[in-house]
């Protein structure tokens, strides 16, 4: 046991498996489920995680819409089929040959079909909007504090660059975070939108990805910030194609 | 715990070199940044490039030094930055040093090595 | 992004108290750290995280300071202060831009 197998861990991914056998005896880490080698300066992608969270399955979510167009994650955990760079394949299907198409973070965007079903491209899911309650206060936060301290927060946990979260909104209880990335704005490195909102959703939950950190502690100007729920509404660059009959 | 580069020294214009960083008393796969970090002669510091040395190899570059210099890491105990089509604006001291935490965003550099010098003339 | 140090030069007698400023054109949070460093030598950190005091410095260094306007107050001067400053983040290494401060020369009588 040497000082480099101590060193070699995944800060940013607890599912993960890591030892000094990478190029030159350097660390290398293996997200579970797929064995697919991940970046541990970074956040790994929302696929990847999903894949090896399929070993201990929670409980499915229903979120609502806000509006005709946008995606909420109705259809709970599956296990994600991911290409070599950890994103979602355009399109998924189960065990028993049932296939729909996914946007860039995983959600369903079509009606569920069979394995004749085409999804021609992964379509890009540029703007999430993460609508949190708080638990009650004495007084509301400052509006300009609790802004400072989401960007914060999405910067220095999340590695997301301040120019993605697009703005803060606030009524008391409730707040909302507006993340926005085009395909055009996202540069190689950049941490994407659909990542960070996934590592935030799970932080909420009290379920960290991050290797032996402490849960999430949100602070404004010291006063603790809980959150009571999260719904996560996610628009695609491409509206999603539903038959009426989903609609109605 | 020390570091110390090589490969310095005199270069003709247009010319190319390869500066080594070696670390000793610790590992190379930690999880955290190493940095090249260059001064001119009475001038201040200025960053060329990173690269995390844990799982990964991610790396950032200073605007002005993307295509100019790559920096990477083959072993747990050097890293390496290349350079090309050198000028006389581009001699300077060149240290490497250490990140203190794994998250590039919140780095500051605990641990430095002597530098080595690069003189860009004919 | 820009780190803007002031003054880039000062000069106070022993036992005096200097303060160098550096402002970033951005909010970094509380991501600052501040080096000394002496002609010859590589830098030597002082200061992280704004304020935090790095092993062995003597606290007659102080960091203040957060958002944009930070501050390094160095009092009780010594013979052994005389070196150049500089402040430094790294908060948008991704915008390819140079974290570092124009230093601050600190010359002791």
């Known amino acids: 046991h040497t000082a480099a197998q101590d060193n070699c861990t995944c800060p940013t991914n607890k599912m993960t498996v890591c030892s000094p056998d990478g190029p030159g005896g350097r660390c290398q880490c293996r997200a579970l489920g797929s064995g697919v080698a991940v970046d541990c300066s970074t956040l790994t992608s929302k696929c990847l995680l999903l894949k090896a969270r399929m070993s201990a399955p929670k409980n499915a979510r229903t979120l609502v819409r806000p509006n005709e167009h946008a995606l909420v994650d109705n259809d709970g955990l599956y296990d994600p089929d991911c290409d070599p760079e950890g994103r979602f394949k355009a399109r998924q299907c189960n065990q028993t040959s049932v296939c729909w198409c996914v946007n860039s973070v995983g959600v369903r965007r079509t009606d569920k079909g069979d394995l004749s079903l085409r999804c021609d491209e992964l379509v890009r899911t540029h703007h999430i909007l993460i609508d949190l309650r708080h638990r009650p206060t004495a007084s509301a936060f400052n509006h300009s504090d609790l802004d400072a301290e989401l960007r914060r927060l999405f910067r220095e946990r999340y590695r997301l660059h301040p120019k993605f979260v697009a703005a803060v909104h606030y009524e008391q209880p409730t707040i909302q975070i507006e993340l926005r990335q085009n395909t055009s704005q996202k540069a190689a490195g950049d941490v994407d939108i659909g990542d960070a909102a996934y590592y935030f959703e799970r932080d909420v939950k009290g379920e960290s990805l991050f290797q032996g950190r402490g849960g999430l502690d949100l602070r404004v100007r010291g006063e603790p910030l809980q959150v009571e729920r999260t719904l996560i509404y996610y628009l695609d660059e491409i509206p999603p194609k539903f038959s009426m009959k989903r609609l109605t | 715990q020390q570091l110390e580069e090589s490969g310095g020294g005199l270069v003709k214009p247009e010319g190319s070199l390869t500066l080594t960083c070696k670390g000793s008393?610790?590992?190379?796969?930690?999880?955290?940044w190493m940095w090249w970090v260059r001064q001119a002669p009475g001038k201040g510091l200025e960053w060329i490039a990173?690269?995390?040395?844990?799982?990964?190899?991610?790396t950032y570059y200073a605007s002005w030094a993307k295509g100019r210099f790559t920096i990477s890491s083959t072993s747990s105990t050097a890293v390496t930055l290349q350079a090309t089509s050198l000028t006389a604006a581009d001699t300077a001291t060149y240290f490497c040093?250490?990140?203190?935490?794994?998250?590039?965003?919140?780095?500051?550099?605990?641990?430095w090595g002597p530098g080595t010098l690069v003189t860009v003339s004919s | 992004f820009e780190m803007t140090q002031t003054p880039s030069s000062v000069s106070e007698p022993v036992g005096g108290t200097v303060t160098i400023k550096c402002q970033a054109s951005?909010?970094?949070?509380?991501?600052l750290g501040w080096y000394q460093q002496k002609p010859g030598q590589p830098p030597k950190l002082l200061i992280y995280?704004?304020?935090t005091l790095a092993s062995g410095v003597p606290s007659r260094f102080k960091g203040s300071g957060s958002g944009t306007e930070f501050t390094l107050t160095i009092s009780d001067l010594e013979c052994a202060d005389a070196a150049t400053y500089y402040c430094?983040?790294?908060?948008?290494?991704?915008?390819?831009?140079?974290?570092f401060g124009g230093g601050t020369e600190v010359v002791v009588k």
């Open positions: 040093a250490r990140g203190a935490t794994n998250n590039v965003f919140m780095n500051y550099f605990n641990l």
């Open positions: 008393g610790f590992d190379f796969s930690g999880t955290y």
């Open positions: 990173c690269i995390y040395v844990g799982s990964g190899s991610s």
């Open positions: 951005e909010d970094i949070s509380s991501n």
């Open positions: 995280g704004a304020s």
């Open positions: 430094q983040t790294s908060y948008y290494i991704d915008d390819g831009v140079n974290g």
